[in-house]
C-alpha cells in the first residue's frame, strides 16, 4: 500500500436510511472467534503517525534482530530493509542469522511512484508485544528501493496483512499472517486501533507517543465503545468491502453506488488518506466546500497540497462537515454507517507548525484505483479483521480525536436495497493483479 499517500502510508442506489430498525442480530459477543476480552500485552504496541504509518516492533532471525515494521493491510508481503539505506537506522542482516534460509528467488514490487526489490527467504519471526510465539515466515530482504522508505518514519520494513492473492511475486508466497495461523493455535483474526494525534507532534514527541494497538488473535474490548458492526469481505485479496451510500453532513451524494466502489473499496492501514474515485471525490469536495462555505480555502488545499494554518487552539472544527460511509451489513438489505469528523480528515502536519500555529492538510484525495479507507478513516474506529468469518468490524475507537460537540460514530441498522449491485466487477485479465500503485 503506498502511504505517500500510500505510505508506504499510501492521504447511489442505496435507499435513504429510513431508520427502520431491523431485528437485532444474534449478539455478536457470543459469536466472535478468538480469545475474548483482554490482550493487555498487545495494547499500545503500535507507534507512528497517520502521515508516515503505524509500526510494530518485530524480531527476525537467530539471534533475534529487532526492527520496526509498518503495519499494512493493503499488501501481503513481509519485506524488510536488508541493506544500508540513508533513511534506515538499522536493517536485517541475513548473514548474522543462523536460521535464515535462502529461497533463491527474487521479488520486484513497483508502485505508481517508487518501488522495492529484494531476495526471498524464510526465517524465524516474532512480535515482542504480540502473541508469545515464533513462526517461520517468508521474508523479502529489500536490497534496492526507490521512494519506499520514509525519512524519519522510524520503520525499516513492511508487514503486509492482506491475502495471498496479491502477494508478490505470486500467490504461492504465503503471507505472514497465514503462516502465523497455520503454525500456531492463534485464531484467524486481528484488530487495529490507530490513534491519530489530532495535533502536530515534533520528532521527539512522535517517537515517544503511543500510536495504537494491533491485537493478534482477537478483540480487546477496552479499545472501543458501543458495539461492533460487521461488513462482509467481498473477496479475499485486499480487504475489499462494499460502500452503499455516502453522505456529507447528512446530505446524500446521490450517486449510483457502483461509483463508490469503482473499481474496488478497500481498508488499508498503509494509506494515509481517504481516497475516493474521481467522480466521487469531485462530488464530495463540492459538498464539503458548500458545507464550509462561510470560509474559502485555496485550491491547493483541496488538492491535499497546501496547508491551512490557524492560530494554535483556534481550528474551527465546527465549520467542517462530517463524512459518513454506509457499508453493506451482514443481513440482507441492511447497512450501517461509519461517520468521521474533520479531526480525522484534516491531518495535522508537524514540520511546519510552530507553537503559534496548527497547520493541516486535507486528507481526502482522488484515486484511480477505487476507494481506499486509509489511516484517516481507521483513526476514528477500532477495526476488526475477522478473516475466519470473512468480515470486517467497525466500532468507535476509544482513542479517536473529537470535540465536545461531535464524535465519530458507527450506527445502524439502515434499510438499503440491492446492495449487491453496488459492487464493481473488475474485468479479468492477466494483468489485473499487477496494479499495485498506491500513490
Amino acid at each position: 500500500t503506498h502511504l505517500g499517500i500510500r505510505l508506504p502510508l499510501r492521504s447511489g442506489l442505496a435507499g435513504p436510511p429510513l431508520g427502520l430498525r431491523l431485528p437485532r442480530e444474534t449478539d455478536e459477543e457470543s459469536e466472535e472467534p478468538g480469545r475474548r476480552g483482554s490482550f493487555v500485552e498487545m495494547v499500545d504496541n503500535l507507534r507512528g503517525k497517520s502521515g508516515q504509518g503505524y509500526y510494530v516492533e518485530m524480531t527476525v532471525g537467530s539471534p533475534p534482530q529487532t526492527l520496526n515494521i509498518l503495519v499494512d493491510t493493503g499488501s501481503s508481503n513481509f519485506a524488510v530493509g536488508a541493506a544500508p539505506h540513508p533513511f534506515l537506522h538499522r536493517y536485517y542482516q541475513r548473514q548474522l542469522s543462523s536460521t535464515y534460509r535462502d529461497l533463491r528467488k527474487g521479488v520486484y514490487v513497483p508502485y505508481t511512484q517508487g518501488k522495492w526489490e529484494g531476495e526471498l527467504g524464510t526465517d524465524l519471526v516474532s512480535i515482542p508485544h504480540g502473541p508469545n510465539v515464533t513462526v517461520r515466515a517468508n521474508i523479502a530482504a529489500i536490497t534496492e528501493s526507490d521512494k519506499f522508505f520514509i525519512n524519519g518514519s522510524n520503520w525499516e520494513g513492511i508487514l503486509g496483512l492482506a491475502y495471498a492473492e496479491i502477494a508478490r511475486p505470486d500467490d504461492s508466497l504465503e503471507p505472514f499472517f497465514d503462516s502465523l495461523v497455520k503454525q500456531t493455535h492463534i485464531p484467524n483474526i486481528f484488530s487495529l486501533q490507530l490513534c491519530g494525534a489530532g495535533f502536530p507532534l515534533n520528532q521527539t514527541e512522535a517517537l515517544a507517543s503511543v500510536g495504537g494497538s494491533m491485537i493478534i488473535g482477537g478483540i480487546d474490548h477496552s479499545l472501543y465503545t458501543g458495539r461492533l458492526w460487521y461488513t462482509p469481505i467481498r473477496r479475499e485479496w485486499y480487504y475489499e468491502v462494499i460502500i452503499v451510500r455516502v453522505e456529507i453532513n447528512g446530505q446524500d451524494l446521490k450517486m449510483d453506488c457502483k461509483e463508490y466502489n469503482y473499481d474496488k473499496s478497500i481498508v488499508d492501514s498503509g494509506t494515509t488518506n481517504l481516497r475516493l474515485p474521481k467522480k466521487v471525490f469531485e462530488a464530495a469536495v463540492k459538498s464539503i466546500k458548500a458545507a464550509s462555505s462561510t470560509e474559502k480555502f485555496p485550491d491547493g488545499f483541496w488538492l491535499g497540497e497546501q496547508l491551512v494554518c490557524w492560530q494554535a487552539g483556534t481550528t474551527p472544527w465546527n465549520i467542517f462537515p462530517v463524512i459518513s460511509l454506509y457499508l453493506m451489513g451482514e443481513v440482507t438489505n441492511q447497512s450501517f454507517r461509519i461517520t468521521i469528523l474533520p479531526q480525522q480528515y484534516l491531518r495535522p502536519v508537524e514540520d511546519v507548525a510552530t507553537s503559534q500555529d496548527d497547520c493541516y492538510k486535507f486528507a481526502v484525495s482522488q484515486s484511480s484505483t477505487g476507494t481506499v479507507m486509509g489511516a484517516v478513516i481507521m483513526e476514528g474506529f477500532y477495526v476488526v479483521f475477522d478473516r475466519a468469518r470473512k468480515r470486517i468490524g467497525f466500532a468507535v475507537s476509544a482513542c479517536h480525536v473529537h470535540d465536545e460537540f461531535r464524535t465519530a460514530a458507527v450506527e445502524g441498522p439502515f434499510v438499503t436495497a440491492d446492495m449487491e449491485d453496488c459492487g464493481y466487477n473488475i474485468p479479468q485479465t492477466d494483468e489485473s493483479t499487477l496494479m499495485t500503485g498506491r500513490a
Epitope: T294, K296, P298, G300, C309
Partner: antibody
Framework: QLQLQESGPGLVKPSETLSLTCTVS??????????WGWIRQPPGKGLEWIGM???????WYNPSLKSRVTISVDTSKNQFSLKLSSVTAADTAVYYC????????????WGRGTLVTVSS | EIVLTQSPATLSLSPGERATLSCRAS??????LAWYQQKPGQAPRLLIY???KRATGIPARFSGSGSGTDFTLTISSLEPEDFAVYYC??????????FGGGTKVEIK
C-alpha cells in the same frame, strides 16, 4: 478593468486608531474566487502581511497584529476596510490593499498604496 | 514557521546581462512560491506564481524555477525598467503571510 484604491488619513496620532478603506472598481468584491487583503511596508523595509477578508466576512489576521487589527467588508459599497488600534511610530508605513487570486493564494492585483505616518 | 531567505541582498548588473535571484525556504514549500517586482514609489507587481508560471502580461524574459526549498528567478536580459526590488513569497502554508527580505537589482 479591476482597480483598487486606498483612502484614509495620512497622519495618525500615537495611541489612536488608523482607519483605511479600499474601494474596488471595475468588478464586484462579492465574486467568490478572491480574498481581499492588506499589506504594509515601513519606509525602506520589506513587505508585511496584515490580514485579509472574504466577502462573507470571514477574516484572517497576522498573529503579531491580531489583537489590534479589524478588517471589515461592505459589499454594497464594494469596499473593505482596515482598522489598526493603539498605533505607535512603528506602524508608520505605506499601506497597500490587494486582491488574493490565483487559487486564492497570491496577491495578483494591488492598489497604489497610501503612506500613513504615526506622529504627534 | 517557514522563513524565506533571499540572496544576494543586492545585485549590480548592466542592461542586457542575465540576472539570477535566489530564494531559499527553511523547509519545503512544494511549488507554492511567487515572485514580485517593486519599483521605487510603486506597489509590488506579481511576476511569477506556482514557482514557474508567469502572471498575465509579464514578459517572457522573466522565468521562475525550483521546487521544495530552492527557487530561482531569472531575468534573461535586463531591460532598464527591470531595475527594482524583487520579493519572493511562499503560500504552501496559508494564509499567505510569508515574504522574503528582498533582492535589489541595481544598475552597475
Amino acid at each position: 478593468q479591476l482597480q483598487l484604491q486606498e483612502s484614509g488619513p495620512g497622519l495618525v496620532k500615537p495611541s489612536e486608531t488608523l482607519s483605511l478603506t479600499c474601494t474596488v472598481s471595475g468588478g464586484s468584491i462579492s465574486r467568490g474566487s478572491y480574498y481581499w487583503g492588506w499589506i504594509r511596508q515601513p519606509p525602506g523595509k520589506g513587505l508585511e502581511w496584515i490580514g485579509m477578508i472574504y466577502y462573507s466576512g470571514s477574516t484572517w489576521y497576522n498573529p503579531s497584529l491580531k489583537s489590534r487589527v479589524t478588517i471589515s467588508v461592505d459589499t454594497s459599497k464594494n469596499q473593505f476596510s482596515l482598522k489598526l488600534s493603539s498605533v505607535t511610530a512603528a506602524d508608520t508605513a505605506v499601506y497597500y490593499c490587494a486582491r488574493v487570486g490565483h487559487g486564492i493564494s497570491y496577491f495578483d492585483l494591488w492598489g497604489r498604496g497610501t503612506l500613513v505616518t504615526v506622529s504627534s | 514557521e517557514i522563513v524565506l531567505t533571499q540572496s544576494p541582498a543586492t545585485l549590480s548588473l548592466s542592461p542586457g546581462e542575465r540576472a539570477t535571484l535566489s530564494c531559499r525556504a527553511s523547509q519545503s514549500v512544494s511549488s507554492y512560491l511567487a515572485w514580485y517586482q517593486q519599483k521605487p514609489g510603486q506597489a509590488p507587481r506579481l511576476l511569477i506564481y506556482d514557482a514557474s508560471k508567469r502572471a498575465t502580461g509579464i514578459p517572457a524574459r522573466f522565468s521562475g524555477s525550483g521546487s521544495g526549498t530552492d527557487f530561482t528567478l531569472t531575468i534573461s536580459s535586463l531591460e532598464p525598467e527591470d531595475f527594482a526590488v524583487y520579493y519572493c513569497q511562499q503560500v504552501y502554508t496559508w494564509p499567505p503571510r510569508t515574504f522574503g527580505g528582498g533582492t535589489k537589482v541595481e544598475i552597475k
